[in-house]
C-alpha cells in the first residue's frame, strides 16, 4: 500500500546520451592525470562517519569523505565538473538550480501526495462503489489487487526509462494519464465494471512512473543531510495522500452527495501538478548533486546487478520485511474501515449501509490516524534510530524490528477492542500504525548502506517489484477470500460479517511478525554487507582496470 | 433450467403476520442476488427487498413503504429466499414475486432476469 | 428516490407497425435502465438490460436505446403476441424503481 517501491529510490544511473559517457571518460582521464581525485574524479577512501571537518558528504548511504573544497574550477571542488565538462556540455546554473530546488522538491513531494490521495480516495469510497456496481467483497478486493498488480509491473520498466530518457517529461505524462484516466472513471456506467477495474490498473501504470523516478531526482538535487531531509518529506507524501485520500473520499462525497465526485478531485490537481512540474523541475543530469554520480557510471549488466542482489543477504531479507509491511498496509488499508463499520453494526451504533454514503465516518477518522501516524511514524523512526546509531551499528535494522514486533501486538489488539469499544480500537490502530511505519525512513537508509550507488535504481525497482508481489498485490484480495470463505461456513448475522473479516484479518499482525523476524535477520548481516558496499565504493574511485565490482 | 417458485400467500387480517417462501433450483443460489417484487391488482410492479449473497455480508435493502414491517432472509443450505411480512396493511394486498438478480462472479446487477409465477397476498377484514 | 415516468400510458397499433415507448428519469441515471414485458396474467419477463443491451432468448424486432434522463424502447414491426405492459426500471440508485408502465394495445 504505502509507497515501498520509492522508499530507496535516492540516486541515478546512467548519463542521458553516449556523447556525454564519452565526455565523461575523457574528463576522467585528464582528472587522472592532473593527479585529482577530488569531488570531480573521485571521493575519498575514508569510511562511513570518519572525517574531518568539512568533508563529508552525508548521504542516505552513509558519510563518504572528499576532497577540501576550493575555488569553483579547481580540481576537488564541486565546481570543477563544470569546469573539466568542456562548453559541449549542458550543466544547470548553480544559481537558477539553487533558487528553484527548494520549490522542485516540494512540487515532486505535492505530486507524491497527489499519487496516494489518488490511489486511496477510492478506499475512502469502497462502499459506495461496491453499492453502484453491485460489487461483491471479491470484486473490491480485486480492484486494489489489480492496481497494485499493474504498478508492480510497470515500476521496473519505468525505472529502466527513467534511467535513459528525459525524467521529467516521463513524470508529468505519468500525472496526465493517470489524471486523465481516473477522471474518465468517474463517468463508468454501472454495467462496466470491468472498466472500473481496468481503469485502476491503468492507473496503476501511470502512478509507476511517478513514484519510480521522482525519489531519483530529489537524489539529484540535493546531497548531505538536506537529501535526507527532502527524502523524508517526500516519504511523508506517502502517509499524508494516503490519509487525504480517505478525507477527501468521504468528505467529497457527502458534499456532492455523489461518490463520483471524490474521483474527480485528485486528476484536476493532478493536471495542475504535471504542469507544475514540466515548468518548475530543472533538468538536472543522473547524479547532478552527489559529486560520483558523473563518475559511477553503470559498468556491471543488468544480470549481473541482479546476482549481486540476490546474494546481498541484508538487502533480501530487508526487501522480504518490507514486503511484510506491504502486505499488513495494503490489508489494513483496505479493510479495516469496512471492519469497524460492521463492529459498530454489531454494537448497535450504527446501522447496516443500506445505501451510499456509506461509513463515510469510520474512512474520515482512518484518514486521519494514517496521515498523522505517518508523520509521527517517520519522526519517531529516524529519532529512534539516530539515538540507537550511539549504542550499535545494527541499529537500522535492530530498530525496524522492534517497530516491527511492537506494531503486531497493537494489530492484534484491534480486534480485540474492536468487540466491545471503537475508540479502543482506533487507540490500537494508532499506536500499532505509528509503529508500522516508523520502518519507511529507516528501510530506505538500509537499502543506500547496502547497495552500491551504481546498482542502486535496480534495487529500488527489484525491491519494489517483490514488496508488491509478495505484500500488497494480492493481501486485499487475499483478506477478502478468507473472509468469504470464513462467512460460507457460517450463519448469516451482522456478527458474523464482523467475525469473518476479523479472522481474515488476523493473518497481518503475523505477516508483520515474520517482517519483525526478517529484520532480525538483516541485523545479522547488515554490518558486513555495509562494509562490502563501502569498500566496493572507494574501488569505484580507482581506474576500471582495478574495479572489481 | 431457473425455476423460482413462490408459497405461502393466502388471506390475512390487517395487523397480522405472513411469511412468503420462495424455493429456487438450477443455479448456483448461495452466490446470488434475490429480490421481492409485488404488483398491486391492477397497478404497476413495486420492488420490495434485496437480498446480496454472502460475498456481499448477505446485506438486506427495503423499500421505504415495508420498512421495518417486512424482513428479507435467505437459507443457502436449502436454497430458498424468504419475506417475512409484519404488520400487514390493506394496501400490501398484491401478487409478491421472487426474483433473480443477474450474477457476475465478482459483481451482480441489480434487474431481474429471472421471475417466478407470483403468489398472491390478499389483506382485508 | 429516482422517478420513472412512461409516456404514453397507453399506445394503440396495427400489427406490422413500429413503436417507440419513452421512459424518463427525475435525474440522469447513466444507462442504469432496463425494460420488462408482461403479458396479461403473466410474470414480467426482462426485456432490454442497460438501456440497449440485449438479451438471449428475445426476438432481435426489440431494441433500446437513451442515456441520462430520456430513454427508448423500440418494437420493430410490432407482432400479436408483443400487445402487453412495458415497464422501465432504474438501477442506479437504491431503491430500485419502475415506471408505471405503458399498455400497448391493438388499434
Known amino acids: 500500500m504505502m509507497c515501498l517501491e520509492c522508499a530507496s529510490a535516492a540516486a541515478g544511473g546512467a548519463e542521458e546520451e553516449e556523447a556525454d559517457a564519452e565526455r565523461r571518460r575523457r574528463r576522467r582521464g585528464a582528472q587522472r592525470g592532473a593527479g585529482g581525485s577530488g569531488c570531480c574524479g573521485a571521493r575519498g577512501a575514508g569510511g562511513a562517519g570518519v572525517s574531518a571537518a568539512g568533508d563529508e558528504v552525508q548521504t542516505l548511504s552513509g558519510s563518504v569523505r572528499r576532497a577540501p573544497t576550493g575555488p569553483p574550477g579547481t580540481p576537488g571542488t564541486p565546481g570543477c565538473a563544470a569546469t573539466a565538462k568542456g562548453p559541449g556540455a549542458q550543466q544547470p546554473k548553480p544559481a537558477s538550480l539553487g533558487r528553484g530546488r527548494g520549490a522542485a522538491a516540494a512540487i515532486l513531494s505535492l505530486g507524491n501526495v497527489l499519487n496516494y490521495l489518488d490511489r486511496y480516495t477510492v478506499a475512502g469510497v469502497l462502499l459506495d462503489i461496491q453499492q453502484h456496481f453491485g460489487v461483491k467483497d471479491r470484486g473490491a478486493g480485486l480492484l486494489q489487487s489489480v492496481f497494485i498488480c499493474s504498478f508492480m509491473v510497470a515500476a521496473p520498466i519505468f525505472g529502466y526509462l527513467g534511467d535513459r530518457f528525459n525524467r521529467k517529461v516521463i513524470l508529468s505524462c505519468g500525472i496526465f494519464f493517470w489524471s486523465a484516466v481516473t477522471f474518465s472513471s468517474s463517468f463508468i456506467p454501472q454495467q462496466y465494471f470491468w472498466l472500473l477495474v481496468l481503469s485502476r490498473g491503468l492507473v496503476g501504470i501511470g502512478e509507476a512512473s511517478y513514484s519510480t523516478i521522482a525519489p531519483t531526482i530529489i537524489g539529484d538535487l540535493f546531497t548531505k543531510n538536506t537529501r535526507t531531509l527532502m527524502l523524508s518529506v517526500f516519504y511523508f507524501a506517502i502517509p499524508l495522500g494516503s490519509g487525504l485520500g480517505y478525507i477527501t473520499g468521504s468528505s467529497v462525497k457527502q458534499a456532492a452527495g455523489a461518490w463520483h465526485w471524490a474521483l474527480r478531485v485528485s486528476p484536476v490537481l493532478g493536471m495542475i501538478t504535471g504542469t507544475l512540474i514540466l515548468i518548475l523541475v530543472p533538468a538536472t543530469k543522473r547524479g547532478h548533486a552527489d559529486q560520483l554520480g558523473d563518475q559511477l557510471k553503470a559498468r556491471t549488466s543488468w544480470l549481473r546487478d541482479m546476482k549481486a542482489l540476490i546474494r546481498n543477504r541484508s538487502y533480501v531479507f530487508s526487501s522480504l520485511a518490507t514486503s511484510a509491511v506491504s502486505f499488513a498496509t495494503g490489508a489494513l488499508g483496505m479493510w479495516i474501515p469496512l471492519y469497524l463499520h460492521r463492529a459498530q453494526v454489531v454494537q448497535k451504533t450504527a446501522e447496516t449501509c443500506n445505501s451510499p454514503p456509506c461509513g463515510a465516518k469510520d474512512s474520515l477518522i482512518f484518514g486521519a490516524i494514517t496521515c498523522f501516524t505517518g508523520f509521527l511514524g517517520v519522526v519517531t523512526g529516524a529519532g529512534a534510530t539516530r539515538w540507537c546509531r550511539l549504542k550499535t551499528q545494527r541499529a537500522d535494522p535492530l530498530v525496524c524490528a522492534v517497530g516491527m514486533l511492537g506494531s503486531a501486538i497493537f494489530i492484534c489488539l484491534i480486534f480485540v477492542a474492536a468487540k466491545s469499544s471503537i475508540v479502543g480500537a482506533y487507540i490500537c490502530i494508532f499506536v500499532g500504525e505509528t509503529l508500522l511505519f516508523s520502518n519507511w525512513a529507516i528501510t530506505a537508509d538500509i537499502l543506500m548502506y547496502v547497495v552500491i550507488p551504481t546498482r542502486r535504481a535496480t534495487a529500488v525497482a527489484l525491491q519494489s517489484f517483490t514488496s508488491h508481489l509478495l505484500g500488497d498485490a494480492g493481501s486485499p484480495y487475499l483478506i477478502g477470500f478468507i473472509s468469504d470463505l470464513i462467512r460460507q461456513s457460517t450463519k448469516d448475522s451482522p456478527l458474523w460479517e464482523f467475525l469473518s473479516l476479523g479472522y481474515a484479518l488476523m493473518l497481518c499482525p503475523f505477516v508483520v511478525v515474520l517482517g519483525g523476524m526478517f529484520f532480525l535477520a538483516t541485523a545479522l548481516f547488515f554490518v558486513s554487507d555495509r562494509a562490502r558496499a563501502e569498500q566496493q565504493v572507494n574501488q569505484l574511485a580507482m581506474p576500471p582496470a582495478s574495479v572489481k565490482v | 433450467e431457473v425455476q423460482l417458485v413462490e408459497t405461502g400467500g393466502g388471506l390475512v387480517r390487517p395487523g397480522s403476520s405472513l411469511k412468503l417462501s420462495c424455493a429456487t433450483s438450477g443455479f448456483t443460489f448461495s452466490d446470488t442476488w434475490m429480490s421481492w417484487v409485488r404488483q398491486a391488482p391492477g397497478k404497476g410492479l413495486e420492488w420490495v427487498a434485496l437480498i446480496k449473497d454472502k460475498n456481499s455480508n448477505s446485506e438486506a435493502n427495503y423499500a421505504e413503504s415495508i420498512k421495518g414491517r417486512f424482513t428479507i432472509s435467505r437459507d443457502d443450505s436449502k436454497s430458498r429466499v424468504y419475506l417475512q411480512m409484519n404488520t400487514l396493511r390493506d394496501q400490501d394486498t398484491a401478487t409478491y414475486y421472487c426474483?433473480?438478480?443477474?450474477?457476475?462472479?465478482?459483481?451482480?446487477?441489480?434487474?431481474?432476469?429471472?421471475w417466478g409465477q407470483g403468489v398472491m397476498v390478499t389483506v382485508s377484514s | 428516490d429516482i422517478v420513472l415516468t412512461q409516456s404514453p400510458p397507453t399506445l394503440s397499433v396495427t400489427p406490422g407497425e413500429s413503436v417507440s415507448l419513452s421512459c424518463r428519469a427525475s435525474?440522469?441515471?447513466?444507462?442504469?435502465i432496463h425494460w420488462y414485458q408482461q403479458r396479461s396474467n403473466e410474470s414480467p419477463r426482462l426485456l432490454i438490460k442497460y438501456a440497449s443491451q440485449s438479451i438471449a432468448g428475445i426476438p432481435s424486432r426489440f431494441s433500446g436505446s437513451g442515456s441520462g434522463t430520456d430513454f427508448i424502447l423500440s418494437i420493430n414491426r410490432v407482432e400479436s403476441e408483443d400487445f402487453s405492459v412495458y415497464y422501465c426500471q432504474q438501477t442506479y440508485s437504491l431503491p430500485l424503481t419502475f415506471g408505471p408502465g405503458t399498455k400497448l394495445e391493438v388499434k
Open positions: 426474483t433473480r438478480h443477474e450474477d457476475f462472479y465478482y459483481y451482480s446487477g441489480y434487474y431481474f432476469d429471472y
Open positions: 435525474q440522469g441515471i447513466s444507462t442504469s
